[in-house]
């Protein structure tokens, strides 16, 4: 028999390898690339999926301003080094010992420096603003139907405590959700708000992690609703360390 | 029962390539990962990378990486560890194995030698 | 990479006595998402292939004799044999498969006193 006769894959995840390879001849799967063994029943970390995606083949208002040190993800993909609980590494570097520090959802915080930058903790990113702008539709969405539909989602799809979810704000075309998650706050067992965005980030791409299951199809009182703009706005528990030349690039 | 049979013992000289096979049996190839390993004389073992058969995901050591290539025909059930650019260093022990929590399967292992 | 460090490089026992073989890794091997530990241990005797003793840190290997455990969590393992006996004379290794690369100790040789 197969492994795919008996139905070894991993829901959560599609960027994996599953086999019956685990005690007692169980089905486990590992993440492409970091090859660490995967638990299929939530979300796996950003940094494995990071990594896998980089392995794989070839293949006045109520809307929020950003804080002053928010930040957002603008060096792109990078093959980033995952810590054995598939945290990221505070330091990562590239191939041309080029390092610099990430908070954790992976996002550059310091200048790049070179192999002697010190990154003494990963610091946690506990406030997360999603920036969403949706494309026209015959009328504004009804916020509280938007509200509910968006805190569903984040509840049944990415298994997020509604805790997490602070807010949602609606001033058309502009959504914003706001994912907030202290360090005191996420107990054991707890869907990380860095992992349910980036999920997010990629079913609104129409990127889905998810294995087998249909694309995102986010509909409010049946309107769809279809992004075409995401910002995604990262805050950190200490704020980030650039230089002046760079603030004022 | 599951086995792994090795090709046969390769003198190759200083340069050349070698081509390690290792047929395996009485499991499906296509479920299980296949990694390999290095034992150089009097030494510890190292792991070089590893094959999913089934869909040809592969995985190097950075340490082998330009040295190894880890092929795999799911016709034939059979592995392949190919080792190019030969220098002395590479005479070792090479072995196949079939990974996993409680896979202790290992192929008999073959030798190379390289020497001019 | 994850470095396994083993403790000691050589061991000598008397038949019938308990040996004790450590190794140490330099990052937890302990999945959070399973509870499992990624630690196997081998015996390897010369011009054989490593024999699976150990895996997921504790559970012995089918076919494997008791006197033979594994115990530890994290970074810090331990294999015991309870009461060696002469066939038991070989070298151990302890191994990491919890990331890439895969990783094994440097080995340590068992004899007998």
């Known amino acids: 028999h197969t492994a795919a006769q008996d139905n070894c894959t991993c829901p959560t995840n599609k960027m994996t390898v599953c086999s019956p390879d685990g005690p007692g001849g169980r089905c486990q799967c590992r993440a492409l690339g970091s090859g660490m063994a995967v638990d299929c029943s939530t979300l796996t970390s950003k940094c494995l999926l990071l990594k896998a995606r980089m392995s794989a083949p070839k293949n006045a208002r109520t809307l929020v301003r950003p804080s002053e040190h928010a930040l957002v993800d603008n060096d792109g993909l990078y093959d980033p080094d995952c810590d054995p609980e598939g945290r990221f590494k505070a330091r990562q570097c590239n191939q041309t010992s080029v390092c610099w520090c990430v908070n954790s959802v992976g996002v550059r915080r310091t200048d790049k420096g070179d192999l002697s930058l010190r990154c003494d903790e990963l610091v946690r990113t506990h406030h997360i603003l999603i920036d969403l702008r949706h494309r026209p539709t015959a009328g504004a969405f009804n916020h509280s139907d938007l509200d509910a539909e968006l805190r569903r989602l984040f509840r049944e799809r990415y298994r997020l405590h509604p805790k997490f979810v602070a807010a949602v704000h609606y001033e058309q075309p502009t959504i914003q959700i706001e994912l907030r998650q202290n360090t005191s706050q996420k107990a054991a067992g707890d869907v990380d708000i860095g992992d349910a965005a980036y999920y997010f980030e990629r079913d609104i791409k129409g990127e889905s992690l998810f294995q087998g299951r249909g694309g995102l199809d986010l509909r409010v009182r049946g309107e769809p609703l279809q992004v075409e703009r995401t910002l995604i706005y990262y805050l950190d528990e200490i704020p980030p360390k650039f230089s002046m030349k760079r603030l004022t690039a | 029962q599951v086995q792994l049979v090795q090709s046969g013992p390769e003198v190759k000289k200083p340069g050349a390539s070698v081509k390690v096979s290792c047929k395996a049996s009485?499991?499906?190839?296509?479920?299980?990962?296949l990694g390999w390993v290095r034992q150089a004389p009097g030494q510890g073992l190292e792991w070089m990378g590893n094959?999913?058969?089934?869909?040809?995901?592969?995985n190097y050591n950075e340490k082998f990486k330009g040295k190894v290539t880890i092929t795999a025909d799911t016709s034939t059930s059979t592995a392949y560890m190919e080792l190019s650019s030969l220098r002395s260093e590479d005479t070792a022990v090479y072995f196949c194995a079939r990974e996993g929590s409680n896979s202790g399967y290992w192929g008999q292992g073959t030798l190379v030698t390289v020497s001019s | 990479d994850i470095v396994m460090t083993q403790s000691p490089d050589s061991l000598a026992v008397s038949l019938g006595e308990r040996a004790t073989i450590n190794c140490k890794s330099s990052q937890s091997l302990l999945n959070s998402g399973n509870q499992q530990n990624y630690l196997a241990w081998y015996q390897q005797k010369p011009g054989q292939p490593p024999k699976l003793l150990i895996y997921g840190a504790s559970t012995r290997e089918s076919g494997v004799p008791d006197r033979f455990s594994g115990s530890g969590s994290g970074t810090d393992f331990t294999l015991t044999i309870s009461s060696l006996q002469a066939e038991d004379v070989a070298v151990y290794y302890c191994q990491s498969d919890h990331i890439y690369p895969y990783t094994f100790g440097q080995g340590t040789k068992l004899e007998i006193k």
């Open positions: 094959i999913f058969p089934g869909s040809a995901y592969i």
């Open positions: 009485g499991y499906t190839f296509t479920d299980y990962w």
